[in-house]
């Protein structure tokens, strides 16, 4: 499109230059050319001459009509055929856009990643609008009644420095575009309840040479949070089924978790944590791959029914991955295995 054009006349759009997708649209062209009584007025859309639904209203004005216009963007211009002129003469041009009013933002979530210094809020925007849509995030203190507002496109990071007057807030998101406005539901936020511990990392793994070999996985986090609840999930790279082991962790030292695994197999491990009793999980850590050593004696191994030595383990569950061919794109498919945890974070992609 063209932002500024010297018009020798006017072009206007009904119902307007931005309209709801699927509406009927009329575009008018009115010439004000000197020394020209146009034989014809022509319309072009994105540089292509239009042939149909054009009406000459009078000597200076013509209209083109579109039934159910559904292109998100188009550049329209019109020209005149002046007697004695070899080329058509430009009259005017306009950018037009069609789209939808915004949906009400849904699934509003706010978290504070430990050490980040920010509260990060995300939401689902709903169906595409095709036009410029902005989101206004309202953050209102429940203690001082003071309200702050932040403009965003898809998420917002709010410095915790600007949230020092209070611990309890009401957060909601307003979606705004040329065709409408919608508000999300309000979210009650207590800053102490939304902290996600600093990232957990699996640093190494080793398999012992015992009669019954065991694999020890070492993992750590720089979190300062004292009570942390973690899950480690693991599976062979050829398998679709994850096993999940739960731990109460204390990161003042490196965590060691023991597993009795299938010998001579390649395993993928991942860990994630949350502050004990809170709802927000870390994303799963990067996949850590470990090869177990070859077995000496024959035995049928079933990792999920083996005895676990680690005293803090609580339960082991099974979850199926989407594809056995793509270990980097594994997903938790079921939230039912987590007793008492909300579904938040259970659909976190890896990789």
């Amino acid at each position: 499109g063209i932002t500024s054009i010297n018009c020798s006349g006017d072009m206007w759009v009904e119902p307007g230059e931005i309209f709801q997708m699927g509406m009927n649209v009329s575009i008018y062209c009115q010439e004000a050319l000197k020394h020209c009584r146009p034989r014809n007025l022509y319309f072009y859309k994105n540089g292509f001459k239009e042939e149909f639904d054009i009406t000459r209203i009078n000597r200076t004005t013509a209209r083109i009509w579109y039934k159910g216009f559904s292109e998100p963007h188009a550049y329209m211009h019109c020209t005149a055929e002046c007697p004695g002129h070899f080329q058509e003469t430009l009259i005017c041009g306009k950018d037009i856009s069609s789209g939808h009013p915004p949906d009400a933002p849904s699934n509003l979530t706010c978290v504070i990643y430990e050490y980040s210094g920010n509260m990060t809020c995300t939401w689902n925007t709903g169906k595409p609008t095709y036009i410029d849509t902005k989101y206004i995030v309202h953050v209102k203190s429940l203690e001082t009644e003071e309200e702050q507002q932040y403009l965003a496109s898809s998420y917002v990071k709010i410095s915790t420095d600007s949230l020092q007057g209070s611990r309890k807030y009401l957060v909601w998101v307003q979606a705004v575009n040329s065709l409408g406005m919608e508000n999300s539901q309000q979210l009650h936020v207590h800053l102490d309840d939304i902290v996600i511990p600093s990232a957990s990392i699996i640093s190494r793994a080793e398999t012992t040479n015992d009669t019954v070999p065991k694999t020890i996985v070492y993992w750590k986090s720089k979190t300062m949070i004292e009570k942390v609840f973690c899950e480690m999930r693991y599976k062979t790279t050829t398998n679709q089924t994850w096993s999940v082991k739960e731990f109460d962790a204390n990161f003042t030292y490196v965590q060691q978790s023991e597993f009795y695994l299938e010998p001579d197999s390649k395993y993928v491990f991942q860990v994630r944590c949350q502050e004990t009793g809170k709802r927000n999980w870390q994303p799963w850590s990067s996949p850590f791959v470990h090869q177990t050593s070859q077995e000496t004696g024959k035995r049928n191994w079933q990792p999920w029914s083996s005895p676990f030595v680690h005293q803090t383990s609580q339960t082991v569950s099974q979850v199926t991955a989407k594809s056995s061919h793509e270990p980097q794109k594994m997903e938790m498919l079921s939230a039912t295995i987590f007793r008492g945890h909300p579904a938040s974070g259970n659909h976190q992609d890896i990789g």
Epitope: I136, E147, Q148, Q149, Y150, L151, A152, S162, Q174, V176, M181
Partner: nanobody
Framework: QVQLQESGGGLVQPGGSLRLSCAAS????????MRWVRQAPGKGLEWVSG???????IYADSVKGRFTISKDNAKNTLYLQLNSLKTEDTAMYYC??????????GSQGTQVTVSS
């Protein structure tokens, strides 16, 4: 209490420019989102533009590409730069707290008249 005082309006020819100011006091300006609204003769209030505390901006379609909103936290002042003015921009301009909305809190406003 919150006080807002607009200035900078005047009479200008079509295609001309103006810079409106809004001096703010009585609240923490640097943490506040602000907006401009206007009221043309015989018409209702119309939201024009908004800015948040970090400088992110939003504009009404009718002024996009011609008007620029900004704020100077050191001076507790909100600005609206009006370029390529049209006769339909003639209105009383008001500033208010908050990014978006077609209301204002009773400040006296500043008159912009675009006429040849």
């Amino acid at each position: 209490q919150v006080q807002l005082q607009e200035s900078g309006g005047g009479l200008v020819q079509p295609g001309g420019s103006l810079r409106l100011s809004c001096a703010a006091s009585g609240f923490t300006f640097r943490l506040s989102a602000m907006r401009w609204v206007r009221q043309a003769p015989g018409k209702g209030l119309e939201w024009v533009s908004g800015i948040d505390s970090r400088g992110s901006t939003i504009y009404a379609d009718s002024v996009k590409g011609r008007f620029t909103i900004s704020k100077d936290n050191a001076k507790n002042t909100l600005y609206l730069q009006l370029n390529s003015l049209k006769t339909e921009d003639t209105a009383m301009y008001y500033c208010a707290q908050g990014v978006y909305g077609d209301t204002y809190s009773g400040s006296q406003g500043t008159q912009v008249t675009v006429s040849s």
